[in-house]
Amino acid sequence: KRFHDVLGNERPSAYMREHNQLNGWSSDENDWNEKLYPVWKRGDMRWKNSWKGGRVQAVLTSDSPALVGSNITFAVNLIFPRCQKEDANGNIVYEKNCRNEAGLSADPYVYNWTAWSEDSDGENGTGQSHHNVFPDGKPFPHHPGWRRWNFIYVFHTLGQYFQKLGRCSVRVSVNTANVTLGPQLMEVTVYRRHGRAYVPIAQVKDVYVVTDQIPVFVTMFQKNDRNSSDETFLKDLPIMFDVLIHDPSHFLNYSTINYKWSFGDNTGLFVSTNHTVNHTYVLNGTFSLNLTVKAAAPGPCPPPPPPPRPSKPTPSLGPAGDNPLELSRIPDENCQINRYGHFQATITIVEGILEVNIIQMTDVLMPVPWPESSLIDFVVTCQGSIPTEVCTIISDPTCEITQNTVCSPVDVDEMCLLTVRRTFNGSGTYCVNLTLGDDTSLALTSTLISVPDRDPASPLRMAN
């Protein structure tokens, strides 16, 4: 059997096989050693007994999408049945004091591979034997501690495969320079050691995407905006736009990146090399935000122009290869190609509460001689739209430990002047966070307030 017979049906074209060689990967036309690595079809009854105590689940993730030319990393994590884990020696053991369907196990090991490898014979002095090989016959690499690696992972994509010895979690990075753009399929088959052979325990597949567009995302933040994810923002307050470029392999680290903004409000184009920008909308309405990101990235070199055809035959100037035209195209040349990314959003601008201020704090006189609590009036002004709700969060003087939160609807006229009355139990210093809110905005102000003792020697006073 060949690798492509074993590893899935997604067979790319011959063109792909010839032109998209991944560095360090091998063609899936190679032979697969079925004696050492048995192949079971989906639904084969043997899968049921491939692992003691249940089925192992493999989870495959990637940091896709990847800009063509960058590295994409795939990670496989094995999830063992309940109460099982991998120990420091790579053996699979039962977790202490963990009870599964079978109850507590007397044997601490699910798989004691250390014991197996110590018992195994037929090895030469290098620790190499005929069974310490991958499905294509290549020997296992002898990294320090390789004996504690008891899982064999076979990655398969684009008609090629990559084999890796590992523990319960492995990562593989692939350079995408030769990968066809668009969605591609990665399939992984996982085997475990079983004496002098291997047993399949899991198969998993995932789609990844290679693109020639820079993957771009923009986060938007505005002070007083109640919900930053609804793309509704407030008039007359700056919005901070922060561009996040998805570049996990740092492919664009040395590129100059330009950001070209159009805010859709007839303020023209704004070009910047900074990933953050502030913009204030001064009108209500719906606006179309457009961003174009441009980066000069490493890329393929264009084919050389054909040499000019001489009108007369000229005598050769020297041996072939000494031609200065040929010298200009060295195999490792670093060419740059402009890559672009785009982001578009529709932003709604509405009225909101722009500012809130406490202009006065007054101790309210109580009818009782020495009441247990104090009433404080906060006279509050605001700018912008009419608030509908007031919240006060009363906390300790550091403003960290909340003692009391009270929210209530508020009736405010268009002058936006209101008085908020709150109860303080006992004297001392309090931090008061006061927020005024409406449907779209939430404006905050804070103050420290000193509530006096309630005894005859401590007169009622205004705290400022």
């Epitope: 209530s408 609807p409 009736d411 008085t419």
Partner: antibody, heavy 116, light 111 residues
């Protein structure tokens, strides 16, 4: 002079629906929260629902949540209460009131009778 | 069962001073303004006191409101026969997210 005039009350069978209206005048309607308060025959006042000036925030009493819907049309200076799945215990005079942290002006009320 | 507790009835003779109490909790009276409403027989309620102790224009200064902790009270001095009515206290309740009323106090002017 502030005026609130309720309409739309009447006799309805249990499970039925009714829509009350409150026409407001004498103040800037679009700038004020509005509320509905009801009073069952011979009983005390019970708050029903409130709505913010723009209509974006709405509050309901637990007894009507999911059955009643408060709304407003600021261009028509009108407050509404859509009452569905009416029950005998919803029988009351329904008052429209201005504001929501205190009710400074009240309409004369409209009687809703739920009976088979 | 009302969230705010009022005595069901109160009475006094003309010229007397009468006080109606209203007790609640920190989530309503304790941290929100109390209002008082007067409902004359067969009419709609009318705002008498707002923000614990403020009188709207047109309300005689015989009516006064006060609050201490989680209790509020309405005082009517120089009682008159036209004060015979039902009186309700009310406040927003921040825990229930609802406006709550007292059960009402029926004030009778004797003589």
């Amino acid at each position: 002079e502030v005026q609130l005039l309720e309409s739309g009350g009447g006799l309805v069978q249990p499970g039925g629906s009714l829509r009350l209206s409150c026409a407001a005048s004498g103040f800037t309607f679009r700038a004020r929260p509005m509320s509905w308060v009801r009073q069952a025959p011979g009983k005390g006042l019970e708050w029903v629902s409130s709505i913010s000036h723009s209509g974006g925030s709405k509050y309901y009493a637990d007894s009507v949540k999911g059955r009643f819907t408060i709304s407003r049309d600021n261009s028509k200076n009108t407050l509404y209460l859509q009452m569905n799945s009416l029950r005998a215990e919803d029988t009351a005079v329904y008052y429209c009131a201005r504001k929501w942290s205190t009710f400074d002006y009240w309409g004369q009320g409209t009687l809703v009778t739920v009976s088979s | 069962q009302s969230v705010l507790t009022q005595p069901p009835s109160a009475s006094g003779t003309p010229g007397q001073r009468v006080t109606i109490s209203c007790s609640g909790s920190s989530s309503n009276i304790g941290n929100n303004y109390v209002s008082w409403y007067q409902q004359l027989p067969g009419t709609a309620p009318k705002l008498l006191i707002y923000a614990d102790s403020q009188r709207p224009s047109g309300v005689p200064d015989r009516f006064s409101g006060s609050k201490s902790g989680t209790s509020a009270s309405l005082a009517i001095s120089g009682l008159r026969s036209e004060d015979e009515a039902d009186y309700y206290c009310g406040a927003w309740d921040s825990s229930l997210n609802a406006y709550v009323f007292g059960g009402g106090t029926k004030l009778t002017v004797l003589g």
